[in-house]
């Protein structure tokens, strides 16, 4: 299936040009998306091209400037947040990145009724997190690991917690491992729907071992960065959940929410919190051995001013074939009765589907079914449930939006997006206004991305929000590679792959092949999305064929494929890449003497193991910021898939699956190892150990470190990285510079 055919014809060839590396590094062909910042059923805010914050009213068709670019510029604001009562806006400036999601910033409050900044009782700086209540204009914020509350922006703050301490106790914000591997947010506090209560997590990292690495900076002596970071098998953070009444915060103070007994009996995690009503909250907990999850619905007891979590409102989700959930355990979407909910989990056939839980999980009503997976529940209204899945035409790498009418019996299903722009758009996400009165669809490809606005009742398209016209015009004289998504059937396993082919691809010729791999559990690389990136350039200009393969362990094709890697990381992911390469060679257009593999992070691990597989298939390869031993990586992630590194659990496979154990096998390949020295995620330690093992085995290899760079290798390092990797590959493939 050719998804992005080249527009090259002989008559046009003179005017067309190939992509250059400079195009990629400059972001010349980047696209824009439009996500409305919904503030009601029919209104959204958006930052205009000239940086005004503009309100759009869909019903009247009119626009209104609510915050001028001058006001934004006066405090160098890079972000804003409107209070729900529309009286105030917070302006965020001095953004300072911490980890993947977390950052600190300075906040100013602007009064929209008088057009002035609020003076008196200003916020301290820098703040770790700040948010408005869902109703009115109360403020909750985290400063120096403690939570504060303001009834109004100009009021003095009320301090909720007092035990916050850097790297020790975190209130309202996650520690490193919860941020990266469990919550995937910078915050750990949640307002109740009407702002009566504020729930928050407290993470105690006192006993967690610390990772320490040098940050070289510009000073005479390097700084040492210390992060409490639990590696596999190490002591984990201790989590507690508290709820405080924000109307009378001093009255009884924070009340702890009890942990279900079956969870509290051994090490556990808190995985998410969902408010149902102002007086009902749903907490999800997970055993440290992550195959048992408990969803606990708790109610406020007015008489005792406490939270009660009856056993009858505990719902257990257990996996017997792998870990609980996909990458994370899914979160519930409650219906209007405030007790029943919709949730995605595995059905009896091992496919993740939407279920409706009214009393017990055992009696759950399955809402979707088939040999495909429901991926996300976007919104549940009185009469409709909107979700995404990869059902359409049996392509796992697509995403379409569906509506199920839950107000009628039997429920009817409609694909909202399947036939909208079928060639251009096969991978969607959506953003809904209040009560799903309107919604935006954001199409990511395979054609040029487009964002559109729709009526939530009729699904009618109202207007195009962003169609990337400039990008379309810029690409008109570019020789883009061809892309195809197909599948290989091997030993009852379906291996979906994406192949990126040079513009003038000729099946009768031989091309060098580069495998790009990620391959981590519950990931997906073969997606019907638009991208003009480094591998596009390698195909367009350098004439390489690039392939991405989703093997065992990858997502959205059922539990059999997903859980195949359970407790055995580093085996089947590598096997499947190798199997695919052999199939590609059989196709006849691959030069089998010029095959390379590269990957980043988990992909660096897989590429390293593939290079060291002893197959002789790969001439060369690159590992960027690879994991080299699962004993070096975070507990929450690693143990989910590998269990514990103990003798009575899975220590043997922890030891067998290291890159270092295969050092000898690198002798016959060209290996480029790359890592940032300030990688807080996959520590430089991983590459240091690979390098040490290779040196000890007297194996030659190439390496590049990026001083003070983290897992993302951003900024100027990106340019250096891709330039360096390009030279390496061209040398490996004997391509002239």
């Amino acid at each position: 299936i050719v998804l992005r055919p080249s527009r090259v014809h002989n008559s046009e060839e003179n005017t067309m040009r190939a992509l250059t590396l400079k195009d990629i590094l400059n972001g010349t062909f980047s696209y824009k998306t439009f996500f409305p910042n919904w503030i009601s059923g029919q209104e959204y805010l958006h930052q205009s091209a000239d940086n005004n914050i503009v309100l759009y009213n869909i019903e009247t068709g009119q626009s209104y400037t609510i915050l001028s670019n001058r006001t934004m510029k006066s405090v160098n604001a890079s972000n804003y947040g409107l209070s729900p009562d529309r009286q105030f806006v917070y302006l965020e400036s001095d953004y300072s990145k911490l980890w993947r999601y977390s950052y600190t910033a300075t906040y100013y409050i602007y009064d929209l009724s008088n057009g002035e900044f609020v003076r008196g009782n200003e916020l301290p700086r820098p703040i770790q997190y700040l948010c408005w209540s869902p109703v009115g204009s109360k403020l909750a914020y985290v400063y120096q690991n403690n939570i504060y509350l303001k009834q109004r922006p100009g009021d003095p703050p009320f301090q909720i917690t007092f035990n916050g301490r850097e790297n020790k106790i975190f209130n309202g914000i996650p520690d490193w491992v919860y941020e990266e591997e469990m919550l995937a947010t910078k915050y750990a506090l949640w307002w109740s729907p009407n702002g009566k209560f504020l729930a928050y997590a407290e993470f105690n990292d006192t006993d967690i071992p610390v990772i320490a690495y040098s940050y070289y900076g510009d000073e005479q002596y390097p700084r040492t960065i210390n992060i409490p970071y639990p590696k596999a098998g190490a002591k984990n953070p201790v989590v507690r959940i508290f709820i405080i009444d924000t109307t009378y915060p001093a009255y009884v103070g924070p009340q702890e929410v009890p942990v279900p007994a079956m969870i509290a009996s051994s090490d556990y995690y808190f995985s998410w919190l969902t408010w149902v009503t102002d007086e009902r909250v749903c907490l999800q907990w997970l055993k440290r051995v992550q195959n048992v999850s408990v969803l606990s619905i708790c109610d406020f007891r007015e008489d005792w001013q406490t939270w009660d979590c009856p056993k009858t409102q505990e719902h257990i989700e257990e996996s017997r074939t792998g870990w609980a959930g996909g990458f994370f355990v899914s979160t519930p979407v409650f219906s209007y009765d405030a007790i029943s909910y919709y949730k995605i989990f595995s059905d009896k056939d091992g496919y993740k589907h939407i279920h409706y839980i009214k009393d017990t999980v055992e009696n759950a009503i399955q809402i979707t079914s088939g040999k495909w997976e429901a991926i996300n529940i976007f919104r549940v209204t009185q009469d409709s449930l909107f979700y995404s899945s990869n059902e359409f035409e049996e392509y796992p790498g697509r995403r379409n939006i569906y509506r199920i009418s839950i107000g009628s019996y039997p429920p009817s299903k409609k694909c909202v997006t399947c036939h909208l722009r079928k060639e251009r758009c096969q991978y969607y996400t959506a953003s809904f206004s209040d009560y799903a009165k309107y919604y935006a669809l954001v199409c990511y490809g395979p054609g040029i991305p487009i964002s559109t606005l729709h009526d939530g009742r009729t699904d009618q398209e109202i207007k195009i929000l962003e169609e990337n016209k400039e990008l379309e015009n810029a690409l008109k004289n570019i020789q883009l590679p061809k892309e195809e998504i197909k599948k290989l059937e091997v030993d009852e396993i379906t291996l979906w792959y994406k192949m990126i082919l040079p513009p003038q691809f000729d099946r009768s010729k031989k091309y060098p092949l580069l495998i790009q791999v990620y391959g981590g559990p519950c990931s997906q690389s073969v997606r019907s999305v638009f991208a003009v990136n480094w591998i596009s350039y390698l195909a367009s200009k350098e004439g390489m064929v690039i392939a991405l393969v989703d093997g065992r362990g990858t997502a959205f094709q059922g539990d059999k494929l997903l859980y195949a890697v359970y407790r055995k990381l580093g085996v089947y992911e590598v096997e499947d890449q190798i199997t695919a390469v052999r199939k590609f060679i059989e196709m006849g257009f691959i030069d089998e003497k010029r095959i390379a593999i590269w990957g980043w992070s988990y992909g660096g691990y897989v590429s390293s193991l593939a290079l060291a597989s002893g197959t002789g298939l790969f001439k060369c390869g690159i590992a960027v910021a690879p994991v080299s031993s699962w004993e070096y990586y975070a507990s929450v992630y690693t143990e989910r898939f590998m269990g514990l590194p103990t003798k009575d659990d899975n220590l043997e496979h922890y030891k067998n699956s290291t890159v270092m154990a295969r050092a000898e096998y690198f002798r016959n390949v060209d290996y480029l190892l790359i890592h940032g020295t300030a990688d807080d995620n996959v520590h430089f330690q991983n590459s240091a150990q690979i390098a040490k093992a290779l040196v000890n085995a007297q194996v030659d290899f190439q390496a590049m470190w990026y001083s003070d760079q983290n897992h993302g290798l951003s900024g100027l390092s990106t340019n250096h990285l891709y330039t360096h990797m390009t030279h390496f590959l061209k040398q490996c493939f004997s391509l002239s510079d």
Epitope: S63, R70, R86
Partner: antibody, heavy 119, light 111 residues
Amino acid sequence: QVQLVQSGAEVKKPGASVKVSCKASGYTLTDYNMDWVRQAPGQGLEWIGDIYPNTGGTIYNQKFKGRVTMTIDTSTSTVYMELSSLRSEDTAVYYCTRFRGIHYAMDYWGQGTTVTVSS
Amino acid sequence: EIVLTQSPATLSLSPGERATLSCRASESVDNYGLSFINWFQQKPGQAPRLLIYGTSNRGSGIPARFSGSGSGTDFTLTISSLEPEDFAVYFCQQSNEVPYTFGGGTKVEIK
């Protein structure tokens, strides 16, 4: 301080057009929409329409559709409202009002322009 | 269009008394928890002046004796203690739906 100064009174014959101006000062014209409201003698208030100064985008009361045109001249910070095909029932005081979009509120008003339509 | 009905048409009160003005909408003017009902004061020969916006928020420089309340279809403007300068005509107005509409007004006169 915010000021909206409107043009002077007009007397027009039925079928003619009138163009009322409103000069804004004390704030940046493009930061707020401008609405027009009229008040017939001894009567209530009637909303005519709204203009978004950044693009000149307008919304009009259906009752005036086809007869009203709102325009803007950012160089002079002036907004105009033209009403055509005048009839006697268009006799009224016409007000320009600054419209604070986030609150959908007309927070400052011009002094009014009396338009008399008489044969 | 949304019709706003104000009552009473005239309110005769003495300075210092409490004034309660009513405004009823022909359909709900609630917009997801916010009601775009505004109140204006108009004195003879003058332009209207914004008193209350969004049902209950006082406009710039408006004294605390003026307050607004209500939701759905029923809204109230209250003047807790009438001052001599408060005797005027009061209009309610909705901005929830185009065309924006005004009530017929309540005249507050000296008894």
